[in-house]
């Protein structure tokens, strides 16, 4: 077990190991072009991410694989994501022609935790917004962030209501990150 | 070099110095009335900030000067900002009379990094939203926050699409901050 | 006073105690159904919260009581909240029948600090948005988060412009948290 310098704060009996901050698991992932995938009717598709080019990085055993951030050690993490959505209401738009209405009723982002030992994913954070834009081109971000107690082996992903509406053009518009506190 | 207590975590060969949390660079800046400044056509103007009155502070060598937060040491920082925009569509409004339409097509906030050795700024975070308000008075916030690896000497600023639409009336509505993790 | 291992970084004369991260005050609170309460005309009502079931927790002397998070030790805290609002414009809606218009002009969230020794609460963060939805059902989140220097004994609460519009249906939609940095 990691020893470090140990001390017993007066308000707590157990010894807590000290920890170098630069050694903590951290990740900031940025948007990439999404490849349309099959997903079940009532299940929001997961985004995949850039994890090492530009502003994106993973460090200290926090790994990204197959749409998931893998939690390498138990603890309290701050988790955040922004997804920028955009659409066009022009009749001739490519998306409209493909039979998908691109002025949706709503847009939703969910940060989800998956634990191998438990079959059902846990929704940690949800940002959901009705869409009533009247212009022909609309765009807007949904931002989420909060602290959660995670276990080693947990996996995190970001799900959205409609992948075709996600703005993947710039790494600063759509992103996903987590760091051990 | 800062020594502190050192230990070698099992998953990493190098020694990482321990660090007192109260000693880390931190800042929370709050809005002030903006003085209109010249800016190039395709370049968003930077906001300037209150750094020591009310809720605002800088500490541990994190300094604010001339619209910039100066990063005093390399590391991973959490950076955040909220900008509240507002406008009026009344014909008689002061801003409309000045010849600037104050029902814009969109509102945008960008948190930007500037490195002295390189003239071109790097956009770290962007929140951008189309505006389709139908009432005469409209207002809304854009919030941004994420973690980035910064280098000593980097400078951070907040740029907006239109300074005249920024709500500078209250320190809790429009703000900008960063802290070393 | 908590001793720990002490060291004097070169840029500061005072000794700063090292601190185990797992020992820091932290809380993440989640929404519950609100019981309508009397509140003064110009004062926004405070939300109450779940503090121990599901994703909610308090730890390391950070306690929740009677709508307030109690700050157990002085320091810099990151504080955040998201409130999801929703309403219906249908004439037959329950809320409309009760005589309260549920298409409000605006929606507002405020994170407020109360200090026993000071009579007036301090507004730390405000997210406020005009509402111009045109559909019959509307919903949207307001997210806030920033860092503040708090004192032992300070109390934090979340106030909203209209409790009846808060979406209390899911713990991932409306939440409130704080952690010592």
């Amino acid at each position: 077990a990691l020893k470090g310098q140990e001390f017993a704060p007066s308000h707590q009996q157990v010894y807590a190991p000290l920890r170098a901050d630069g050694d903590k698991p951290r990740a900031h992932l940025t948007v990439v072009r999404q490849t349309p995938t099959q997903h079940f009717k009532n299940q929001f598709p997961a985004l995949h991410w850039e994890h090492e080019l530009g502003l994106a990085f993973t460090k200290n055993r926090m790994n990204y694989t197959n749409k998931f951030l893998l939690i390498p050690e138990s603890g309290d993490y701050f988790i955040y994501s922004q997804v920028t959505f955009r659409g066009m209401t022009s009749e001739s738009s490519e998306i409209r022609q493909a039979g998908r209405p691109n002025k949706p009723d709503s847009i939703t982002v969910v940060i989800t935790k998956v634990t191998d030992s438990y079959p059902e994913p846990t929704q940690l954070l949800m940002g959901t917004k009705s869409v009533s834009e009247v212009g022909s081109n609309w765009f807007q971000p949904i931002y989420l962030g909060a602290m959660f107690s995670l276990q080693e082996g947990d996996k995190l992903m970001v799900n959205v209501s409609d992948i075709s509406l996600v703005d993947y053009t710039k790494e600063d518009k759509t992103f996903f990150g987590a760091f051990l506190l | 070099a800062l020594k502190g207590q050192e230990f070698a975590p099992s998953h990493q060969q190098v020694y990482a110095p321990l660090r007192a949390d109260g000693d880390k660079p931190r800042a929370h800046l709050t809005v002030v009335r903006q003085t209109p400044t010249q800016h190039f056509k395709n370049q968003f103007p930077a906001l300037h900030w209150e750094h020591e009155l009310g809720l605002a502070f800088t500490k541990n060598r994190m300094n604010y000067t001339n619209k910039f937060l100066l990063i005093p040491e390399s590391g991973d920082y959490f950076i955040y900002s909220q900008v509240t925009f507002r406008g009026m569509t009344s014909e008689s409004s002061e801003i409309r009379q000045a010849g600037r339409p104050n029902k814009p097509d969109s509102i945008t906030v960008v948190i930007t990094k500037v490195t002295d050795s390189y003239p071109e700024p790097t956009q770290l975070l962007m929140g951008t939203k189309s505006v389709s308000e139908v009432g005469s008075n409209w207002f809304q916030p854009i919030y941004l926050g994420a973690m980035f690896s910064l280098q000593e000497g980097d400078k951070l600023m907040v740029n907006v699409s239109d300074i005249s639409l920024v709500d500078y009336t209250k320190e809790d509505k429009t703000f900008f901050g960063a802290f070393l993790l | 006073a908590l001793k720990g291992q002490e060291f004097a970084p070169s840029h500061q004369q005072v000794y700063a105690p090292l601190r185990a991260d797992g020992d820091k005050p932290r809380a993440h609170l989640t929404v519950v159904r609100q019981t309508p309460t009397q509140h003064f005309k110009n004062q926004f009502p405070a939300l109450h919260w779940e503090h121990e079931l599901g994703l909610a927790f308090t730890k390391n002397r950070m306690n929740y009581t009677n709508k307030f998070l109690l700050i157990p030790e002085s320091g810099d805290y990151f504080i955040y909240s998201q409130v999801t609002f929703r309403g219906m414009t249908s004439e037959s809606s329950e809320i409309r029948q009760a005589g309260r218009p549920n298409k409000p002009d605006s929606i507002t969230v405020v994170i407020t600090k109360v200090t026993d020794s000071y009579p007036e609460p301090t507004q730390l963060l405000m997210g406020t948005k005009s509402v111009s939805e045109v559909g019959s059902n509307w919903f949207q989140p307001i997210y806030l988060g920033a860092m503040f220097s708090l004192q032992e004994g300070d109390k934090l609460m979340v106030n909203v412009s209209d409790i009846s519009l808060v979406d209390y249906t899911k713990e991932d939609k409306t939440f409130f948290g704080a952690f010592l940095l």
């Epitope: 990439v32 090492e52 530009g54 460090k59 053009t169 | 490195t115 690896s149 | -």
Partner: antibody, heavy 124, light 107 residues
Framework: QVQLVQSGAEVKKPGASVKVSCKAS????????ISWVRQAPGQGLEWMGW????????HYARMLQGRVTMTTDTSTRTAYMELRSLRSDDTAVYYC?????????????????WGQGTTVTVSS | EIVLTQSPATLSLSPGERATLSCRAS??????LAWYQQKPGQAPRLLIY???NRATGIPARFSGSGSGTDFTLTISSLEPEDFAVYYC?????????FGQGTKVEIK
Amino acid sequence: QVQLVQSGAEVKKPGASVKVSCKASGYDFTYYGISWVRQAPGQGLEWMGWISTYNGNTHYARMLQGRVTMTTDTSTRTAYMELRSLRSDDTAVYYCARESYYGSGEYRGGMDVWGQGTTVTVSS
Amino acid sequence: EIVLTQSPATLSLSPGERATLSCRASQSVSSYLAWYQQKPGQAPRLLIYDASNRATGIPARFSGSGSGTDFTLTISSLEPEDFAVYYCQQRSNWPWTFGQGTKVEIK
């Protein structure tokens, strides 16, 4: 202007190590990764590996794994490539190259700025 | 690792002619393919990134196309300075890999 300047030619004996430096100027060093590419006399280009100047993550060609180490010093805006246990077939011109990235999920870019090359000769 | 096969190995053409160079990947690389030009004694130069995007300062006579496994670099009308070796490189999966090169020589 944007440029990468490499260290000078080296002559090494088999079994020795060589460390080539690559100093960047004119751009935000930590934003763009650095790849190292070598070219043996009369041969094609061989990608050796990549390092993130942002946080030091690396990827190496399988053939060189265990013999090559790439590092960066952000304070001097310099990337380094060390190759150990040199053999005669390591004789080549070694290039560093900036990995362009356009900050967009649409594009992966390419190696848009190259150093002038460093000739490493391995001979007994 | 992904293997890139370029063809032909050598292309003999006259100035003004059209050059068509091929690069085939052993598995899909989406559109993450770059083309480089190298002249004797010089460092390579980026021509095309992401299969079809011209790099800064590259003349319009150079164009790229393709996605998945089959890619083409076209030089619409060869200029004297275009006679060189051309390499494709995949940037889809680590390790990055280069093709073996196509030499475009004067006929």
